[in-house]
């Protein structure tokens, strides 16, 4: 069958992308906080 995806399929995909971006941002912030903490402890 040559059936295309519907918008619902593609909207869920968009939501997943947004959540993945948010997760990546959260991890980056966590890493930054950890680095800052290590700098403080290191001093």
């Amino acid at each position: 069958s040559e059936e295309p995806p519907i918008s619902l399929d593609l909207t869920f995909h968009l939501l997943r992308e947004v959540l993945e971006m948010a997760r990546a941002e959260q991890l980056a912030q966590q890493a930054h906080s950890n680095r800052k903490l290590m700098e403080i402890i290191g001093k």
């Epitope: 069958s1 040559e2 059936e3 295309p4 995806p5 519907i6 918008s7 619902l8 399929d9 593609l10 909207t11 995909h13 968009l14 992308e17």
Partner: antibody, heavy 114, light 106 residues
Framework: EVKLEESGGGLVQPGGSIKLSCVAS????????MAWVRQSPEKGLEWVAE??????????FYAESVKGRFIISRDDSKSSVYLQMNSLRAEDTGTYYC?????WGTGTTVTVSS | QIVLTQSPAIMSASPGERVTISCSAS?????MYWYLQKPGSSPKPWIY???NLASGVPARFSGSGSGTSYSLTISSMEAEDVATYYC?????????FGGGTKLEIK
């Protein structure tokens, strides 16, 4: 909100060219297979062309009546799909809709007349 | 190409009446899609993948079928249901539409 918005229609002489555009929003455009459908009082609803997504190598398909005259293309970075219409005939007159199976735009009208 | 034949072409129903519109395919398809069009407006997706109602479609509408035989049913006709209904197949290229069923109210 999922939305498709067409533009570019107008009056064109037989043998002339025109390019239609459609901007999408509210979904992951790069994953979509986009199609153009037209409607006229004479022929009713008629599928014109379709372009698959990148995963399917942006494969294109055309109705026999437009093959060799129309070109469908897309720009995923702009969430847009286009229909380049060449060698236009009177029978190409109609309202052109940008579509997904479950979403249609409001259409743009093309009139081919001298 | 797959030819879709809708029946009836025109029909009239009384308020509260059950309405069934049929769409017959010349060869087997995996799903059917339905669109509603009111005069002066663009077609609206109404039922997708045979039986799923598009957003905002009243629950009195339903879709069913398989193979070469599909239908759209209105359990209880209302004045706002007056429109032309089209079926479409996405099973293969070229995509094709039925000729439409114009639904009127008595």
């Amino acid at each position: 909100e999922v939305k498709l918005e067409e533009s570019g229609g107008g009056l064109v002489q037989p043998g002339g060219s025109i390019k239609l555009s459609c901007v999408a929003s509210g979904f992951t455009f790069s994953g979509a297979w986009m199609a153009w459908v037209r409607q006229s009082p004479e022929k009713g609803l008629e599928w014109v062309a379709e372009i698959k997504n990148k995963a399917n190598n942006h494969a294109t398909f055309y109705a026999e009546s437009v093959k060799g005259r129309f070109i469908i293309s897309r720009d995923d970075s702009k969430s847009s799909v286009y229909l380049q219409m060449n060698s236009l005939r009177a029978e190409d007159t109609g309202t052109y809709y940008c579509t997904l199976p479950d979403v249609w735009g409001t259409g743009t009208t093309v009139t081919v007349s001298s | 190409q797959i030819v879709l034949t809708q029946s009836p072409a025109i029909m009239s129903a009384s308020p509260g009446e059950r309405v069934t519109i049929s769409c017959s395919a010349s060869s087997s398809v995996s799903n059917m899609y339905w669109y509603l069009q009111k005069p002066g407006s663009s077609p609206k997706p109404w039922i997708y993948r045979t039986s799923n109602l598009a957003s905002g479609v009243p629950a009195r509408f339903s879709g069913s079928g398989s193979g070469t035989s599909y239908s759209l049913t209105i359990s209880s006709m209302e004045a706002e249901d007056v429109a032309t209904y089209y079926c479409q197949q996405y099973h293969s290229f070229p995509r094709t539409f039925g000729g439409g069923t114009k639904l009127e109210i008595k």
